[in-house]
Interface confidence: low
C-alpha cells in the first residue's frame, strides 16, 4: 500500500492540473494554460513546483498559497497581473525561483518580495515596469539571477541594487535607459553577467562599472554610445565585451588596458574611423580582431602581448607598411586580412608559421620577393588581386606545400612563376594584360578552376571542343613549331588535310580530359577563338 504521505500527494492535485512526484516525496504541479482566473485552492502542502503560467489570473489575494513551505519554484508568467499585494508570497520559505514575466506590472512589487530569503532567481521581464523602489530587493540576500529586461525603465535603479551582493547575472536589456551614472552597480561584487543591450544609452559615468569585480560578460550592443566606454577599465575579469551597433567613432590608445582577460570583443557596426596604435595591446586571450573601414588608421597596430591572435582583419584603412617584426608579435596567426589598404612593401611572413589564409587584395604592392611567403607550410589561400605586382621572384611560391588557392588577378604581370604551385586547385590570373604566354596543364595536376587574361590561354586546359569546331581557323599559314604543345603529338600539324587536323584535335582534347577536367575562363568561343594558340609559348 501507499504511505499516508503519498496519499496526501494524490489528494493535493487540483482539477485539470497535471501532477507528478518530484523524486523527493514532494509534488510537481502543472496548472499552466488552463484558463484559470484564480489560484487553485486544494494544493498539497508538499508541493515543490507550481506552474500557473499562461492563465487569466489578474490578481493575487494576500496569502493565497498558505503553508506551501516546501515550494521551491513558482511560475506565474503570462498572466494579467498588474499588482501583487503584500503577503502574496508569505510563508514560501523555500522559494528559490519566482517567475512573473509577461504580466502587466508597473513597478516591482516591493512588499510582496520582502523576506524571500531563499530566492535565487527572479524574473520580472516583459512587464511594464517603469519604477523600481529603492528598497524593493532589500530582503533578497540569496538572489543570483535577476531579469528586468523588456520593461519601461528610463534609468538604472541604483539604490535598489545596493543589497544584491550575491547577484551573479542581471539583464536590463530592452528598456529605455539613457545614462549609467557612477557607481551604478557599486555593490554587485559577485555579478558575472550584465546585459544592457537595446537601450538608449548615450553616456556612461567614468566610474559607472566600479565595484563589478567579478564581471565577465558585458553587453552594450544596440545603444547610442558615441564615445568608447572607457569605464570598462576597472573590469579586470572581463572576458566578453559587446558594444556593436552604437555610434562610436574612435577607440583610444590602451583602450583595454584594464581588461587582460578579454576573449571576445564585438564592436562591428560602429562608424569607427580611428583606432589608437596601442589599443589592442596585452590581450593574451584574444583570438579574433576584426576592424573594417577605419579609414584614419595609417599605422599597423602594435599588438605586443596579444600573441594568441588567430584571426586579424584590418581592412579599408590607410596602412602603407607593415613592421618587419609583425609575425614576431603574432606567432599563432591563422588568418590575415589586410585588403583595401595602401600597402606597398611586404615583410617576410615566414615566422607566422600557422598562417592558413592571407588576403592582401586592393593594395599597392608592386613586388613579391623570395622571402615574403617562404616556408608557410600551412598556407592554403593567398589573395594578391588588384595590386600593382609586376615582379614575382621565381621561387616566391616554392615552399608553400599546402597552397590550393592563388589569386593574382588584376596586376601587371608579364610572366608567372610556377615553381611550387603543383598543388593548386584554384588559380586566377585574369586582368594581367601583359601576361600573354601559355600555361601548361601538366604543371597543375590538381587544378579545378583557372581564370586567365585571354580566352586562347584556356585551350591548354581542354575547354576548346566547341571553339575548334566553330572557329576552325587555326592561322593556316602559320609555320610555328608545335613541339611544346604536346610532346607525344609533336609535328602533327604538318598535315594539311583538314580531317587529319580534326582527328589530331580530338586526340589532343581526349588526352587533356584524361588528365583532369578544368573549369577555365574566359572560355573560347566564336568571338574568342583559339587562333592565338600558336602565338605564344607554353610555360614549362
Amino acid at each position: 500500500g501507499s504511505s499516508p504521505r503519498s496519499g496526501v500527494l494524490l489528494r493535493g492535485c487540483p482539477t485539470h492540473c497535471h501532477c507528478e512526484p518530484d523524486g523527493r516525496m514532494l509534488l510537481r504541479v502543472d496548472c499552466s494554460d488552463l484558463g484559470l482566473s484564480e489560484l487553485p485552492s486544494n494544493l498539497s502542502v508538499f508541493t515543490s513546483y507550481l506552474d500557473l503560467s499562461m492563465n487569466n489570473i489578474s490578481q493575487l489575494l494576500p496569502n493565497p498559497l498558505p503553508s506551501l513551505r516546501f515550494l521551491e519554484e513558482l511560475r506565474l508568467a503570462g498572466n494579467a497581473l498588474t499588482y501583487i499585494p503584500k503577503g502574496a508570497f508569505t510563508g514560501l520559505y523555500s522559494l528559490k525561483v519566482l517567475m512573473l514575466q509577461n504580466n502587466q506590472l508597473r513597478h516591482v512589487p516591493t512588499e510582496a518580495l520582502q523576506n524571500l530569503r531563499s530566492l535565487q532567481s527572479l524574473r520580472l521581464d516583459a512587464n511594464h515596469i517603469s519604477y523600481v523602489p529603492p528598497s524593493c530587493f532589500s530582503g533578497l540576500h540569496s538572489l543570483r539571477h535577476l531579469w528586468l529586461d523588456d520593461n519601461a525603465l528610463t534609468e538604472i535603479p541604483v539604490q535598489a541594487f545596493r543589497s544584491l551582493s550575491a547577484l551573479q547575472a542581471m539583464t536590463l536589456a530592452l528598456n529605455k535607459i539613457h545614462h549609467i551614472p557612477d557607481y551604478a552597480f557599486g555593490n554587485l561584487s559577485s555579478l558575472v553577467v550584465l546585459h544592457l543591450h537595446n537601450n538608449r544609452i548615450h553616456s556612461l559615468g567614468k566610474k559607472c562599472f566600479d565595484g563589478l569585480h567579478s564581471l565577465e560578460t558585458l553587453d552594450l550592443n544596440y545603444n547610442n554610445l558615441d564615445e568608447f566606454p572607457t569605464a570598462i577599465r576597472t573590469l579586470s575579469n572581463l572576458k566578453e565585451l559587446g558594444f556593436h551597433s552604437n555610434n562610436i567613432r574612435s577607440i583610444p590608445e590602451k583602450a583595454f588596458v584594464g581588461n587582460p582577460s578579454l576573449i571576445t570583443i564585438h564592436f562591428y557596426d560602429n562608424p569607427i574611423q580611428f583606432v589608437g596604435r596601442s589599443a589592442f595591446q596585452h590581450l593574451p586571450e584574444l583570438r579574433t580582431l576584426t576592424l573594417n573601414g577605419a579609414s584614419q588608421i595609417t599605422e599597423f597596430p602594435d599588438l605586443t602581448g596579444t600573441a594568441n591572435l588567430e584571426s586579424l582583419t584590418l581592412t579599408g584603412a590607410q596602412i602603407s607598411s607593415l613592421p618587419q617584426t609583425v609575425c614576431n608579435q603574432l606567432p599563432n596567426l591563422q588568418v590575415l586580412d589586410l585588403s583595401y589598404n595602401l600597402l606597398e612593401d611586404l615583410p617576410s611572413f615566414s615566422v607566422c608559421q600557422k598562417l592558413q589564409k592571407i588576403d592582401l587584395r586592393h593594395n599597392e604592392i608592386y613586388e613579391i620577393k623570395v622571402d615574403t611567403f617562404q616556408q608557410l607550410l600551412s598556407l592554403r589561400s593567398l589573395n594578391l588581386a588588384w595590386n600593382k605586382i609586376a615582379i614575382i621572384h621565381p621561387n616566391a611560391f616554392s615552399t608553400l606545400p599546402s597552397l590550393i588557392k592563388l589569386d593574382l588577378s588584376s596586376n601587371l604581370l608579364s610572366s608567372f612563376p610556377i615553381t611550387g604551385l603543383h598543388g593548386l586547385t584554384h588559380l586566377k590570373l585574369t586582368g594581367n594584360h601583359a601576361l600573354q604566354s601559355l600555361i601548361s596543364s601538366e604543371n597543375f595536376p590538381e587544378l579545378k578552376v583557372i581564370e586567365m587574361p585571354y580566352a586562347y590561354q584556356c585551350c591548354a586546359f581542354g575547354v576548346c571542343e566547341n571553339a575548334y569546331k566553330i572557329s576552325n581557323q587555326w592561322n593556316k599559314g602559320d609555320n610555328s613549331s608545335m613541339d611544346d604543345l604536346h610532346k607525344k603529338d609533336a609535328g602533327m600539324f604538318q598535315a594539311q588535310d583538314e580531317r587529319d587536323l580534326e582527328d589530331f584535335l580530338l586526340d589532343f582534347e581526349e588526352d587533356l580530359k584524361a588528365l583532369h577536367s578544368v573549369q577555365c575562363s574566359p572560355s573560347p568561343g566564336p568571338f574568342k577563338p583559339c587562333e592565338h594558340l600558336l602565338d605564344g609559348w607554353l610555360i614549362r
Epitope: Q101, N102, D125, A126, H145, D149, D150, Q168, A169, A173, L174, V192, V193, H195, H197, N198, E216, T217, D219, N221, Y222, K239, E240, G242, H244, S245, I263, T264, H266, R287
Partner: antibody
C-alpha cells in the same frame, strides 16, 4: 569552425520523455546561447527555447513552458533539450542552433544536423 | 500559431529577381532590427542568409539582401539561380512575449 553534433533518432511512446543532446566544438561554447528549434514533417520552424551556458539561464517559448527543460554542461560543451509528456504531434526533427551574437534575440548562425523524434504508440 | 506572415510560395525564372515578404506587428518586426532570414533545402538544416535585417554572413552571395519597412521585412534574391530553390523562413524577436517567432515559410521555385 564551429560544429554542433546532435544525438541520434529516437522513437518514443506517448506520455514519455525524450532528451536530445547537442555537442559543440570550439572553445566559445560558454559565451554563446544555444537555442532549440523543431520542425514537424512538412511544417515550418518553431522555436522552443534557449540557454546561455555560462550562467545557466534558460528561456522557453510560452507554448512549451513546463514541458521542456533546456540545460547545458560546460565541461563537455553539450546542451540538452528534454521534452516531457510527449504526444503524437511532437513528432518532428529537433535542431539545436547557436545564437551568433550570444544573446537571445540574435540569429542562429550554426545549426546541428537535426534529431528525428517519433512519438508513436 | 504563426506570428509572422509569409507568402506560401513564390517563383521566378533564372536571372530574375524575387522578393519574399515577412509581415509582423509593432512588437516584433516593427520594433527591433532582430529580423533574420534562413534558407532550407529539403532534408537539410536551415542556413542563415541575412541577420539583423540586412547583414549578410560571410560566405553568403551578395545576390541575397534584406530590408525592412514598418512592420514588414523583405528578402530579395537577384539573379535567381537553380540552387536558390528552397524554403525561406524569416525570424524575429517579439518584445511583447519575449519569444523568438518564425514565419510560416515560403517555398521558392526556380522555373
Amino acid at each position: 569552425q564551429v560544429q554542433l553534433v546532435q544525438s541520434g533518432a529516437e522513437v518514443k511512446k506517448p506520455g514519455s520523455s525524450v532528451k536530445v543532446s547537442c555537442k559543440a566544438s570550439g572553445r566559445t561554447f560558454s559565451n554563446y546561447a544555444i537555442g532549440w528549434v523543431r520542425q514537424a514533417p512538412g511544417q515550418g520552424l518553431e522555436w522552443m527555447g534557449g540557454i546561455r551556458p555560462n550562467f545557466g539561464w534558460a528561456k522557453y517559448a510560452q507554448k512549451f513552458q513546463g514541458r521542456v527543460t533546456i540545460t547545458a554542461d560546460e565541461s563537455t560543451s553539450t546542451a540538452y533539450m528534454e521534452l516531457s509528456s510527449l504526444r503524437s504531434e511532437d513528432t518532428a526533427v529537433y535542431y539545436c542552433a547557436r545564437y551568433g551574437q550570444g544573446h537571445f534575440p540574435s540569429a542562429f548562425d550554426y545549426w546541428g544536423q537535426g534529431t528525428l523524434v517519433t512519438v508513436s504508440s | 500559431d504563426i506570428a509572422l506572415t509569409q507568402p506560401a510560395s513564390v517563383s521566378g525564372s533564372p536571372g530574375q529577381s524575387i522578393t519574399i515578404s515577412c509581415t509582423g506587428t509593432n512588437s516584433d518586426v516593427g520594433t527591433y532590427n532582430y529580423v533574420h532570414w534562413y534558407q532550407q533545402h529539403p532534408g537539410k538544416a536551415p542556413k542563415l542568409m541575412i541577420y539583423d535585417g540586412s547583414n549578410r554572413p560571410s560566405g553568403v552571395s551578395n545576390r541575397f539582401s534584406g530590408s525592412k519597412s514598418g512592420n514588414t521585412a523583405s528578402l530579395t534574391i537577384s539573379g535567381l539561380q537553380a540552387e536558390d530553390e528552397a524554403d525561406y523562413y524569416c525570424q524575429a524577436y517579439d518584445s511583447h512575449s519575449f519569444n523568438i517567432v518564425f514565419g510560416g515559410g515560403t517555398k521558392l521555385t526556380v522555373l
